[in-house]
């Protein structure tokens, strides 16, 4: 269930997709990836206020218990709901090859 | 990939399964759930230091970018990797029914 998509904290403050530009060096990939030399990493960043984009029943429970016991139970967290695949050109023992990674770039986000 | 299960922050400090006892009132369920009257909610709580239980490539990227840009990119977050189903006895318009929820109790945890 994609509960409330309205962010009560103000525009852009709640859980959503962000793009962060990163070099191979930033990612620690320079020794095994040849291309791309820079990655536009899409990731999920932002707050998860009550019922905002609650992924499932567990997220709703977490919201309730966080309200009751904030020192014990953390608020739900903004994480990928799905991913976009991406191809990397990489060095291997046998030479250069293509590898597609299905879990590299966030496609959309929810709170859990 | 379940990277490192050794917690560098000390025993029990990193992402793992916790059990939190909650009443129907705590959960806001008193008006529609009859049983159980108390739920042992299993949830994922704890820190996600570098590569600890990294769920996938995205989590590894997030760790690297958090190290570089801690104010922009949050650390990976401890969330359920899978769930245990749970049955609730609930009130309906037509009486009482059983309903199994597949996404209510965390079964195990990872960092993403």
């Amino acid at each position: 269930a994609r509960n409330g998509d309205h962010c009560p904290l103000g525009p852009g403050r709640c859980c959503r997709l962000h793009t962060v530009r990163a070099s191979l060096e930033d990612l620690g990939w320079a020794d095994w990836v040849l291309s791309p030399r820079e990655v536009q990493v899409t990731m999920c960043i932002g707050a998860c206020p009550s019922q905002f984009r609650a992924a499932n029943m567990h997220a709703q429970i977490k919201t309730s218990l966080h309200r009751l016991k904030p020192d014990t139970v953390p608020a739900p967290c903004c994480v990928p709901a799905s991913y976009n695949p991406m191809v990397l050109i990489q060095k291997t023992d046998t030479g250069v090859s293509l590898q597609t990674y299905d879990d590299l770039l966030a496609k959309d986000c929810h709170c859990i | 990939a379940r990277n490192g299960d050794h917690c560098p922050l000390g025993p029990g400090r990193c992402c793992r399964l916790h059990t939190v006892r909650a009443s129907l009132e705590d959960l806001g369920w008193a008006d529609w759930v009859l049983s159980p009257r108390e739920v042992q909610v299993t949830m994922c709580i704890g820190a996600c230091p570098s590569q600890f239980r990294a769920a996938n490539m995205h989590a590894q990227i997030k760790t690297s970018l958090h190290r570089l840009k801690p104010d922009t990119v949050p650390a990976p977050c401890c969330v359920p990797a899978s769930y245990n189903p749970m049955v609730l006895i609930q009130k309906t318009d037509t009486g009482v029914s059983l309903q199994t929820y597949d996404d209510l109790l965390a079964k195990d945890c990872h960092c993403i």
């Epitope: 040849l34 291309s35 976009n84 695949p85 991406m86 191809v87 050109i89 250069v96 293509l98 597609t100 | -």
Partner: antibody, heavy 117, light 106 residues
Amino acid sequence: QVTLKESGPGILQPSQTLSLTCSFSGFSLNTHGMGVGWIRQPSGKGLEWLANIWWNDDKYYNSALKSRLTLSKDTSNNQVFLKISSVDTADTATYFCAQVAWDWFAYWGQGTLVTIS
Amino acid sequence: QIVLTQSPAIMSASLGEEITLTCSASSSVRYMHWYQQKSGTSPKVLIYSTSNLASGVPSRFSGSGSGTFYSLTISSVEAEDAADYYCHQWSSYPWTFGGGTKLEIK
């Protein structure tokens, strides 16, 4: 296993529009960094890059031919299409499509011969 | 556009000989690929990004260079190496290929 196969009319007359199809399998144009490129080769001559179409629908054309080229794709059916308008005998060549990963023609089709006469 | 000039246009080599094919760019490029095309077949990549051997390519092939000058070396020519060899740049659009070097085996 990645495979690509070009199909075209074989023969057509000057001034007509050449329509080529590249049907591929083993990869998806939904994958970031993935594209399909077209290259041609007149008999006994070298390779000439024509155009690329990318996962995000960006298109790049050889500037010398840009006004005559049109690229499109059908991602769900794993097909890419190239049209070349107003052909003449200089367009006689074997036309290849190739899988492009970022900057690399990684896999090529067998090519289809097109004769303008 | 960046023009790539390959030399020689035709090279004849004996089995076991070491040979070097060159590719000169009209302006500086960051990297160069090399493709091999045997008669009647489609091209396949040999060298990726100047010096990286593609998967499955024999180690007798190697690449080097920078700026405007790149080369492909075959340390010990074998009969199966008879083919056309093309350099390719993608540093700027339009992507371009060199005119090719035909390698014949004596």
